[in-house]
């Protein structure tokens, strides 16, 4: 290996003054060939039996043990910059006349080849006695990733000879590998932030802030935890990484307390049925904690209702929930509230809601359906439903006729404003059984329908009636 | 090569206030931090506290808490005493010292020329 | 806070002869690292401090090996070997061990 030595930015004059290693004459004119990877040999020179890679005659095994042994000579071994510096340094070798066979050098780093455009020159001092070959290596503005062990190789009469390492050492600022990162915290709840800041130059010693003042006057070397025993409120963290370069400071992270959410805002009612609403809701600020679930509550918002709120559970997403089972027609209000790990936040403000007009509850009572022959038609009378408020307002009626007969089969209906309480149709189909079913309407859908009433449909004028399947109390009917 | 170069000498009442300056050349500004240190007539020299030169983030020793402020103008890489309520007993000559903790602790490596404050009604 | 306390005062000297400044201090100024930050600061007349020697015994770049320290503990010493002409002048020991940063009271070290 070389003397270790610490320089900066050294010149090539510097470097490579006065006599080279061996024993070449001061004004021995070298020649240079750059490169940008593979170092070639130059051409051939007097005094060199064969030129560099061409074959050469092959030495008896015998004739090459009695070759002189050839090594690198020594340089430098440990070079020690700044950052952003320019550094050159160098291999160099003497190559007897004797040693037939010679390959170019070649710079290597931590054991890998460097290829590509790197900047180095060999240059060539022949004399009599063979050649001495100094390869020249720079780096312009040095960066950490230049740190490393850099080394010559050449093949030699097929022997690989390889140099000391020079071991470039770029020192800087310290750098972070791990810096605090944003926690949420639970109040007076202890926590661990991480900093860690690497050379060279080591060591690196770190200080932390929190909210601009200093937590420890004392350093911590790299890597440093600091346990925080508890917040009552945000605060920043960071931390200041020192060498003997100088100093950084990490990014600055807030360090935030959980606290239960805000209450969630913009409730609003995306659809009403008659019996359920769809609502939904922009969530509050989530207190630095996820929302968990929500919750929505209804109260009727009549008079005369007693005030119990009902409660429907969801989860937090998404902002939507379709509150069911509600009362036809009637008015609500609703606000929702949200949770996190910490706690319930307050109600959103209420917001009125109503429901819409339900479907009649109760089929038309009291069916009777009788045959005009004369006329061809089926007579139809019913009574209106007993239809409560919230049913709507009733505004006809739909009535339903199956025709059966062998072979045929037709459904059909009708719908008839609600003037009246009686319908006529047309025969379809003789000698067939039609079945009659009659549903109230009102805005808020079609009610049930009634149970069936059948009529036999005769060929001719003979007539079999049944009665309505919803006979009035104490009534029976009969044609 | 670093140099701290440091404002004038300063003649100022009691109750007044001064803000002392100290210009860094030769170096990145915010890569270190400046110390202050006080030398009062035909005394010692008292560590006042420092700054640190990236994040301003400041630490004063206890005798110099309240009435004393270090402050910076990165843009213009000066660091900035401010005295507020000047006594006679603040009479001193102001040093700024360049300053972080190397592998030796605290470095003072570089040091201004010294600002003379001089409080007399 | 840490006391520094040095001694003597005064130091006249004769050029070429040795001085000895001693600086004590209140505390041990050993840290849990094992490094002990006790460091010397010249101030020629009429200049501003330099930085002289840290870590008890190492000289900053610049600084002749006439000058030495040693010490631990509590107990430090500097030395210079032949005092010459530009050493004339006060030094303070500092230590940066504790918070807050301390000096002597400083030596006025000058030629008989």
């Known amino acids: 290996g070389g003397t270790a030595e610490k320089w900066e930015e050294t010149e090539l004059d510097q470097l490579f003054s006065g006599p080279l290693p061996g024993r070449l004459p001061v004004n021995h004119r070298p020649f240079s060939a750059p490169h940008s990877s593979r170092d070639q040999l130059p051409p051939p020179q007097t005094g060199r039996s064969h030129p560099a890679h061409t074959a050469a005659p092959q030495v008896t095994s015998t004739a090459s043990k009695l070759l002189p042994p050839v090594a690198f000579n020594h340089t430098i071994g440990h070079i020690v910059l700044s950052e952003h510096k320019n550094v050159k340094f160098n291999c160099s070798i003497n190559i007897p006349n004797t040693y037939q066979e010679t390959a170019g050098i070649s710079w290597w780093k931590d054991g890998k080849e460097l290829l590509g455009a790197h900047h180095s020159i060999t240059q060539f001092y022949p004399d009599e006695e063979g050649v001495s070959i100094i390869a020249l290596f720079s780096i312009a503005s040095v960066q950490r990733s230049d740190n490393g062990s850099y080394f010559c190789k050449m093949k030699v009469n097929n022997r690989e000879i390889v140099s000391d390492p020079i071991y470039v050492e770029v020192q800087g600022l310290p750098y972070f590998i791990k810096q605090p990162e944003s926690v949420n915290v639970t109040r007076n709840t202890a926590f661990n932030l991480t900093c860690q800041a690497v050379g060279p130059p080591e060591p690196v010693n770190i200080f932390w802030v929190q909210n601009s003042s200093r937590v420890n006057e004392k350093p911590e070397r790299s890597p440093s935890v600091l346990t925080v025993p508890g917040l009552t409120e945000t605060a920043v963290f960071s931390c200041e990484a020192h060498n003997d370069k100088g100093l950084t400071v990490s990014k600055g992270v807030h360090i935030n307390i959980k606290v239960i959410p805000s209450p969630p805002t913009e409730v609003h009612i995306l659809n009403s049925t008659a019996h359920s609403i769809l609502v939904s809701w922009v969530p509050g600020f989530d207190g630095y904690s996820p929302l968990q679930n929500c919750s929505i509550q209804v109260k009727e918002a009549d008079r005369l209702s007693n005030g119990s709120v009902m409660v429907f559970n969801t989860s937090a997403s998404p902002h939507l929930y379709e509150i069911q089972q509600l009362q036809a027609l009637a008015n609500y209000s609703i606000a929702v509230s949200c949770r996190n790990e910490i706690g319930w936040s307050a109600v959103s403000p209420w917001i009125l809601a109503s429901t819409t007009e339900g479907a009649p509850s109760v089929a038309p009572l009291n069916i009777t359906v009788f045959l005009n022959e004369s006329n061809n038609i089926l007579d139809i009378r019913w009574t209106k439903p007993p239809i409560k408020r919230q049913d709507g307002e009733l505004v006809g009626y739909r009535i339903s006729h199956v025709w059966e007969s062998a072979g045929t089969y037709k459904e059909l209906s009708e719908e008839v404003s609600q003037n009246g309480s009686w319908a006529q149709i047309p025969v379809q189909i003789h000698n067939a059984t039609c079945t009659v079913r009659i549903a109230a309407i009102t805005k808020g859908g079609i009610g049930p329908f009634s149970e069936p009433v059948n009529i036999i449909i005769p060929e001719h004028s003979k007539v079999d009636y049944a009665p309505s399947s919803t006979p009035a109390p104490g009534n029976t009917d009969s044609m | 090569q670093v140099q701290l170069v440091q404002s004038g000498s300063e003649l100022k009442k009691p109750g007044a206030s001064v803000k002392v300056s100290c210009k860094a050349s030769?170096?990145?500004?915010?890569?270190?931090?400046m110390s202050w240190v006080r030398q009062a007539p035909g005394q010692g020299l008292e560590w006042m506290g420092w700054?640190?030169?990236?994040?301003?983030?400041?630490t004063y020793a206890d005798d110099f808490k309240g009435r004393f402020v270090f402050s910076l103008d990165t843009s213009v890489s000066t660091a900035y005493l401010q005295i507020s309520s000047l006594k006679a007993e603040d009479t001193a000559v102001y040093y700024c010292?360049?300053?972080?903790?190397?592998?030796?602790?605290?470095?003072?490596?570089?040091w201004g020329q010294g600002t003379t404050v001089t409080v007399s009604s | 806070d840490v006391v520094m306390t040095q001694s003597p005062l005064s130091l006249p000297v004769t050029l070429g002869q040795p001085a000895s400044i001693s600086c004590k201090s209140s505390?041990?100024?050993?840290?849990?690292?094992?490094?002990?930050?006790l460091n010397w600061l010249q101030q020629r007349p009429g200049q501003s401090p330099r930085r002289l020697m840290y870590?008890?015994?190492k000289l900053d770049s610049g600084v002749p090996d006439r000058f030495s320290g040693s010490g631990s503990g509590t107990d430090f010493t500097l030395k210079i070997s032949r005092v010459e002409a530009e050493d004339v002048g006060v030094y303070y020991c500092?230590?940066?061990?504790?918070?807050?940063?301390?000096f002597g009271g400083g030596t006025k070290v000058e030629i008989k």
């Open positions: 870590l008890v015994s």
């Open positions: 505390q041990s100024l050993l840290d849990s690292e094992g490094k002990t930050y």
């Open positions: 030769g170096n990145t500004f915010t890569t270190y931090g």
């Open positions: 010292a360049r300053d972080y903790y190397g592998s030796g602790g605290w470095v003072f490596d570089y």
């Open positions: 700054i640190n030169n990236y994040s301003g983030v400041s």
């Open positions: 500092w230590q940066g061990t504790h918070f807050p940063r301390t």
